[in-house]
């Protein structure tokens, strides 16, 4: 004969465990139903009556099957330097991440607690390491033959243009100014092949290669963090 299906609440077999989405109530000494995400236990079970669940109150949530007496409070509204990437609902907490141009200086289990503005490299300096979701920009001085004339958190040092005739030599914060009508842009060491000789400049050395990838904004996209575990939840 097939085993009878037990309806909650029921006493488990000696040494046995409760089924999925049930929990063992110590007071009633019975297997009782858990409440689904978005709800909490309004009335705990007894020997003769099952758990009574109720919807989470405004601005609270439960993410897992549970038997908590109160839902968890959602986090505060996102601050002005943040964007809400996940709204507070009955089943999930609010997640705030840093808006473009900012990074997370102090993270929390989900999202970010404190955002800080990405460092801007001043003229003469370029981005050595782009900012990420959780780290600031690192700047470096532009090497000989390269320049940056912007204050930017994304611009790298770029090679000076190579002139047929130089009007004003370039430096770390300014590109070279040519007198000829068709300057050539140096892209990388040994990569420039000109059909005629160019004027030499004592300060012009081979430009250092630029980082292989220019930083974009993709690093600001939120990475889904793992959800928090509630005190007395889990299947």
């Amino acid at each position: 004969l097939p085993a009878q299906v037990a309806f909650t609440p029921y006493a488990p077999e000696p040494g046995g465990t409760c089924r999925l989405r049930e929990y063992y109530d110590q007071t009633a000494q019975m297997c009782c139903s858990k409440c689904p995400p978005g709800q909490h236990a309004k009335v705990f079970c007894t020997k003769t009556s099952d758990t009574v669940c109720d919807s989470c109150e405004d601005s609270t949530y439960t993410q897992l099957w549970n038997w908590v007496p109160e839902c968890l409070s959602c986090g505060s509204r996102c601050s002005s330097d943040q964007v809400e990437t996940q709204a507070c609902t009955r089943e999930q907490n609010r997640i705030c991440t840093c808006r473009p141009g900012w990074y997370c200086a102090l993270s929390k289990q989900e999202g970010c607690r404190l955002c800080a503005q990405l460092r801007k490299c001043r003229p003469g300096f370029g981005v050595a390491r782009p900012g990420t979701e959780t780290s600031d920009v690192v700047c470096k001085p532009c090497a000989p033959g390269t320049f940056s004339n912007t204050t930017s958190s994304t611009d790298i040092c770029r090679p000076h243009q190579i002139c047929h005739v130089v009007a004003i030599p370039g430096n770390a914060s300014m590109d070279a100014v040519c007198t000829s009508t068709s300057p050539t842009r140096s892209m990388a060491p040994g990569a420039v092949h000109l059909p005629q000789p160019v004027s030499t400049r004592s300060q012009h050395t081979q430009p250092t290669p630029a980082p292989s990838t220019a930083p974009g904004t993709s690093f600001l996209l939120p990475v889904g963090p793992s959800p928090p575990a509630e005190g007395s939840t889990g299947d």
Epitope: S55, S59, C74, R77, A87, C88, R90, R94
Partner: antibody, heavy 120, light 108 residues
Framework: QVQLVQSGSELKKPGASVKVSCKAS????????MHWVRQAPGQGLEWMGR????????KHDPKFQDKAVLSSDTSVSTAYLQISSLKAEDTAVYYC?????????????WGQGTLVTVSS | DIQMTQSPSSLSASVGDRVTITCTAS???????LHWYQQKPGSSPKLWIY???NLPSGVPSRFSGSGSGTDFTLTISSLQPEDFATYYC?????????FGQGTKVEIK
Amino acid sequence: QVQLVQSGSELKKPGASVKVSCKASGFNNKDIYMHWVRQAPGQGLEWMGRIDPATGNTKHDPKFQDKAVLSSDTSVSTAYLQISSLKAEDTAVYYCARSPYGDFGAMDYWGQGTLVTVSS
Amino acid sequence: DIQMTQSPSSLSASVGDRVTITCTASSSVSSNYLHWYQQKPGSSPKLWIYSTSNLPSGVPSRFSGSGSGTDFTLTISSLQPEDFATYYCHQYHRSPWTFGQGTKVEIK
């Protein structure tokens, strides 16, 4: 844009009942609560109750538990407040206001108000 | 019930004055659940400060809010003609949700 449009003024006799409507537009009715707040002439704001239009669940100030019935019809995006056994002291402007779920009860949009006058 | 008591009930001030309104709760209120509304005669209330210190878009930056526990304040750093109105605090911490009795800001 978000709008809450309430029904017009009402003049009622003592003992009668009145039903005030609040039609919502410009937002999803699913993740909000609709509150009812009253203001007697020259007085302050008094929270009466709220309804979750998605589930029909209501919560009242106990003072209004037997006086006010909250309901909603999601098919027409309208919330209703019915007040029974009207007395002269129920003369007031009745406002509907919404609060989005997760905004800690901040009522960010209000109806224009409905004046209910109870007089014999 | 949590009683919300505002002080003063009314005040007269001049344009340019700094104005502070206080709201005292009879028991502790989480700062997320404390809001302020502005109401002008013949108009519906408007959400003016939410969660103790946050300004909705359109509210001038001369308004600020602060506080925790049982004591909360709304401050106008430099009163302007359009600020003359009644201000209400509101707690959503525990049902029934309650408003303060209001503070009327009048022209001196």
